[in-house]
Amino acid sequence: QNASRGRRQRRMHPNVSQGCQGGCATCSDYNGCLSCKPRLFFALERIGMKQIGVCLSSCPSGYYGTRYPDINKCTKCKADCDTCFNKNFCTKCKSGFYLHLGKCLDNCPEGLEANNHTMECVSIVHCEVSEWNPWSPCTKKGKTCGFKRGTETRVREIIQHPSAKGNLCPPTNETRKCTVQRKKCQKGERGKKGRERKRKKPNKGESKEAIPDSKSLESSKEIPEQRENKQQQKKRKVQDKQKSVSVSTVH
């Protein structure tokens, strides 16, 4: 449309000059550029009541370039689109629209979610966590000796944080009760942290039992089970076997 008008003006107007400015191949004093050099786009610019032809190295925002043998011209993107390769392939949508496969949408299709930062419809990303790391040594108040009941913990890492609609991460910390061989702390051993000492394996028949977290244990001065006789302890251990309680921060 613009191109044919430019060509018609060229035929009508006798004052066609070859010594043109700014990328014009041919031009006139009155109409400006009539045709452009290769790889340049012809566009009509309104100046007051007059339209003059200009040659641009790339189309302005909101327009895309179309090639023809005699002219390259700029054409407007769709109304909801800010930048595009053509009317069917938007690359950036106007405010309030989400880009998906070159189209601008009010809402994202089923199975996708809106990313309000990039203004795109993106795949829903679910949380991914690593395998559990090994259980820590059995400790009580940071010591691995001088007690019978303590706690041990294990952790796992978040590999992939979830997107807004993705599944939340499962617990990343787990703590449980544990029993170690009762032994006095050796000289210089008192107060040694669990991670600095090798963990003693529990005796045969001794069990572990999961607890909410280590804080709840440390807050009680004396664990009731320690007052029970061996007969009662055995009875409890059968009941408590394989109990596991997880503690976590929701991510």
């Epitope: 895309y64 179309t66 090639r67 023809y68 392939f89 950036k92």
Partner: antibody, heavy 117, light 111 residues
């Protein structure tokens, strides 16, 4: 004249990352979008995505979206393609190309990527 | 995605004869009267080279023996008369929709 010069061949191990460069000359770098295309040895062509050097906006073919990243350095008129977590299937020739009015009119010479353990 | 099916996969043509390559799109690649279909030639060890843009327009510097036609979903590349240097693989490519896609290629050999 317009030229796109790509970095040399790459030999990398599975799981690693690679970054291929494409240096443009002979035109104003910010005028045209740069696209990347993958060609499995002697086979067909697969469009990876585009980047506008003027503002860094980029878009990807869904099948490459999670592992490919397109960037530009306008001060060096250079575009980059980074591919992460490489697998044997990523072994191919990668091309950069200028996109002018809906066609690829200038191409780089190609960068051969070989993923091997 | 728009799938482009090229046929034949390969063809052998004598010097001076006509080579015809077809490209069928799974949906129309036309919009507002423009056909977003391009044709490229690729020789071994080289990048693709643009021959035809917008279905029928010859890229500058490309010999007039190359011509393109078609609209909507059916497109054709013709080479006539075929010359020795035309031995190559030819690809069609659509620019109408995201993602941009290519045909699988047609290998042209000389008899």
């Amino acid at each position: 004249q317009v030229q796109l010069k790509q970095s040399g061949p790459e030999l990398v191990k599975p799981g690693a990352s690679v970054k291929i460069s494409c240096k443009a000359s002979g035109y104003t770098f910010t005028d045209y979008s740069i696209h990347w295309v993958k060609q499995n040895h002697g086979k067909s062509l697969d469009w990876i995505g585009y980047i506008y050097p003027s503002n860094g906006d980029s878009g990807y073919n869904q099948k490459f979206k999670n592992r490919a990243t397109l960037t530009v350095d306008t001060s060096y008129s250079t575009a980059y393609l980074e591919v992460r977590r490489l697998t044997f299937e990523d072994s191919a020739v990668y091309y950069c190309a200028t996109y002018f009015a809906n066609n690829f009119d200038y191409w780089g010479q190609g960068t051969t990527l070989t993923v091997s353990s | 995605d728009i799938v482009l099916t090229q046929s034949p996969a390969s063809l052998a043509v004598s010097l001076g004869q006509r080579a015809t390559i077809s490209c069928k799109a799974s949906q129309s690649v036309d919009y507002d009267g423009d056909s977003y279909m391009n044709w490229y030639q690729q020789k071994p060890g080289q990048p693709p080279k643009l021959l035809i843009y917008a279905a029928s327009n010859l890229e500058s510097g490309i010999p007039a023996r190359f011509s393109g036609s078609g609209s909507g979903t059916d497109f054709t590349l013709n080479i006539h008369p075929v010359e020795e240097e035309d031995a190559a693989t030819y690809y069609c490519q659509q620019s109408n929709e995201d993602p941009l896609t290519f045909g699988a290629g047609t290998k042209l050999e000389l008899k």
